[in-house]
Interface confidence: low
Amino acid sequence: ATKAVCVLKGDGPVQGIINFEQKESNGPVKVWGSIKGLTEGLHGFHVHEFGDNTAGCTSAGPHFNPLSRKHGGPKDEERHVGDLRNVTADKDGVADVSIEDSVISLSGDHCIIGRTLVVHEKADDLGKGGNEESTKTGNAGSRLACGVIGIAQ
């Protein structure tokens, strides 16, 4: 199995640790972890194109989208590779992350290793917001915390 890990950090209180595991190169990727310091409710959760955090989370670029598609939800045919889903923070500001995704990969063309994982300020409308921004970012707002996805032992 291939494993990866990402430590999420931002300017504010949001931080987290996210693990990735892929048993077979064409198989699904299991994503699990925890994020704390969030406001209660939904927060967009995406892989962005660049592993560049030199200017904070903004330098990570747009959603990872090697197929040049519109933004969508994780189960949509029309989605960015980096479109995971919303994570839900409870009243303590902690979000449980438990995802299995068959579009991202830890190898090949859809490899997310070396790219940036971002948790956003607001809920991702999953491309259903009815405006142009919805088809790009899901109107998920600012980038609260991010981290480069790296190979784990």
Epitope: G16, I17, N19, K30, W32, G33, S34, I35, K36, T88, D90, D92, V94, A95, D96, V97, S98, I99, E100
Partner: antibody, heavy 117, light 107 residues
Framework: QVQLVQSGAEVKTPGASVKVSCKAS????????ISWVRQAPGQGLEWMGW????????NYAQKFQGRVTMTTDTSTSTAYMELRSLRSDDTAMYYC??????????WGQGTLVTVSS | DIQMTQSPSSVSASVGDRVTITCRAS??????LAWYQHKPGKAPKLLIY???SLQSGVPSRFSGSGSGTDFTLTISSLQPEDFATYYC?????????FGQGTKVEIK
């Protein structure tokens, strides 16, 4: 407030199966996983596995692989844990707990399963 | 599987004492550690998550520290309701595993 309410105590014979239920309320059921933990008499806590309510992904401890099945019913916000081929050393208090990242923040009251011939 | 070793296995203390419980992981678990309090006939209660974050509603006399392989739970001033068994639990990799428990008893 968040609550997990488990089914009542069970007495089973060796070789039988038991199915424990765990009804959740006070939060969005699909946003968190459910873990199952047991404690045998005089022993410590033992993690059995968990299920992601969002997509039914399960991860079982090797010790229980092939003998345990964890399921959920989102229409009733209920999680289930079935343990088959029961042995006397499966006698324990079984707990469900809400999985939140790397911890379990709310727990059911426990279900005592006694395996005896 | 990752082994979690707690010490001591039991401790006798008086009300007002400072109590420290340690937990050692058999390999690096980053900050993936939680602490629970368990009283007979009751469900376990989460005290600390991600090694050092205090669960809401838990008194501030409880604190957690550590990273990597060595972790500590401290009760700064033991109260009568704190006599219980305490468990650490790692979540760095599956299966999640618990320490064997530390029983805090009245001296």
């Amino acid at each position: 407030q968040v609550q997990l309410v488990q089914s009542g105590a069970e007495v089973k014979t060796p070789g039988a199966s038991v199915k424990v239920s765990c009804k959740a309320s006070g939060y969005t059921f699909t946003s968190f996983g459910i873990s199952w933990v047991r404690q045998a008499p005089g022993q410590g806590l033992e993690w059995m596995g968990w299920i992601s309510v969002y997509n039914d992904y399960t991860n079982y401890a090797q010790k229980f692989q092939g003998r345990v099945t964890m399921t959920t019913d989102t229409s009733t916000s209920t999680a289930y844990m079935e343990l088959r081929s029961l042995r006397s050393d499966d006698t324990a208090m079984y707990y469900c707990a809400r999985k939140r990242g790397g911890d379990m923040d709310y727990w059911g009251q426990g279900t005592l399963v006694t395996v005896s011939s | 599987d990752i082994q979690m070793t707690q010490s001591p296995s039991s401790v006798s203390a008086s009300v007002g004492d400072r109590v420290t419980i340690t937990c050692r992981a058999s390999q690096d678990i980053s900050s993936w550690l939680a602490w629970y309090q368990h009283k007979p006939g009751k469900a376990p209660k989460l005290l600390i998550y991600l090694a050092s974050s205090l669960q809401s509603g838990v008194p501030s006399r409880f604190s957690g520290s550590g990273s990597g392989t060595d972790f500590t739970l401290t009760i700064s001033s033991l109260q009568p309701e704190d006599f219980a068994t305490y468990y650490c639990q790692q979540a760095n990799s599956f299966p999640w595993t618990f320490g064997q428990g530390t029983k805090v008893e009245i001296k």
